[in-house]
Interface confidence: low
């Protein structure tokens, strides 16, 4: 009762239901590529103010499989992860222990998702589970946004990924994983 294995023109092998395709090999060793250099901190001295053009809100492309419990998408989706520093930022020394701890002062600008796109994915499930389709909300672009105290903090929660969520007023999907779990998977996978 599984999906039939097939081969298309791109010589992609889709396995029988219950087996999962491995992540594409080029994604295995791109950890450094997908991270802000130097742990995201610019290599400069405290008290130095850099021009805003030297900081950018970067859009890093990640490819991942969407999961819903034991089910996994037939094909991976590509989405953006917002990364980088939004300037200008004045870096101040940390008073505690007089260590050099950098933090931005002034208005709080964050590199956060700006636009989202919906994409349909088909999920293949092992063990006789019926295949499923889901709409997932993926980050389409990033933007430096000035945060106010009224700013919805939930916007900051899921920098990396927007997991498929139940519609408003709907029961939680029995096997839907939390955004946090998907985020953890994303971070661990790459």
């Amino acid at each position: 009762q599984g999906w039939q294995a097939f081969k298309n023109d791109a010589t992609e092998i889709i396995p029988e239901l219950g087996e999962y395709p491995e992540p594409p090999p080029e994604l295995e060793n791109n950890k450094t590529m997908n991270r802000a250099e130097n742990g995201g901190r610019p290599p400069h001295h405290p008290f130095e103010t850099k021009d805003v053009s030297e900081y950018s809100c970067r859009e890093l492309h990640f490819t991942r499989y969407v999961t819903d419990g034991p089910c996994r998408s037939a094909k991976p989706v590509t989405e953006l992860v917002c990364s980088g520093q939004c300037g200008p930022a004045r870096l101040l020394p940390n008073a505690i222990g007089r260590g050099k701890w950098w933090r931005p002062s002034g208005p709080d600008f964050r590199c956060i998702p700006d636009r989202y796109r919906a994409q349909r994915v088909q999920l293949l499930c092992p063990g006789g589970e019926a295949p499923r389709a889901r709409k997932v909300r993926l980050v389409a672009s990033c933007k430096c946004k000035r945060l106010t105290r009224f700013h919805n903090q939930s916007e900051l929660k899921d920098f990396g990924t927007e997991a498929a969520r139940p519609q408003k007023g709907r029961k939680p999907r029995p096997r839907a994983r939390s955004a946090k779990a998907n985020q953890a998977e994303l971070e661990n996978a790459y």
């Epitope: 992609e12 349909r120 019926a130 889901r134 029961k171």
Partner: antibody, heavy 118, light 107 residues
Framework: QVQLVQSGAEVKKPGSSVKVSCKAS????????LNWVRQAPGQGLEWMGT????????TYSQKFKGRVTITADKSTSTAYMELSSLRSEDTAVYYC???????????WGQGTTVTVSS | DIQMTQSPSSLSASVGDRVTITCSAS??????LNWYQQKPGKAPKLLIY???SLHSGVPSRFSGSGSGTDFTLTISSLQPEDFATYYC?????????FGGGTKVEIK
Amino acid sequence: QVQLVQSGAEVKKPGSSVKVSCKASGYTFTDYFLNWVRQAPGQGLEWMGTIYPYHDGTTYSQKFKGRVTITADKSTSTAYMELSSLRSEDTAVYYCAREEEDGQFDYWGQGTTVTVSS
Amino acid sequence: DIQMTQSPSSLSASVGDRVTITCSASQGIQWYLNWYQQKPGKAPKLLIYYTSSLHSGVPSRFSGSGSGTDFTLTISSLQPEDFATYYCQQHSKLPRTFGGGTKVEIK
């Protein structure tokens, strides 16, 4: 708007095969599962199998496995259901139905009557 | 296979009546249950999906509830166009299976 248009009625001899088509329009054909369901006269609905046209993945009801083949032609947005080794109890109306994301069949073809008679 | 049992198999009711149809699954299907309406000579029409979500264009007099193994379709005030056969369908496990149907007739 979404439409599923099926081929016309068929009369077949026992032991032969029938191939029913279902032409989809009004949506992206490769984005949705396309199911086949049949209904014998005066009986209930019986699921036969499904295809996901994006990669031609199929899954069938065990009852029909080996006798049913579901295919899809992406270039014409048409799905096909072929049933072989026909017997009189295969006389039924055969429906194609698009499947939405919670497993619901939200759009159905008008049905194709297949009569198996010697 | 998961067996879906509908009851009653038929019922007679009058316009304005409140009608309840039940559907029982032979094993737990969480909320993966849909309801369809079918009129003679026509294809089924989706009414309710995922146990309780109303399909677009379906009147609000239709509602669904339940979880696990027991589910209910309720028509709060039966209208002339509601006389038809109703089917439940599970989408938890393969193969997808339908209930035997409940025919709602005019009293």
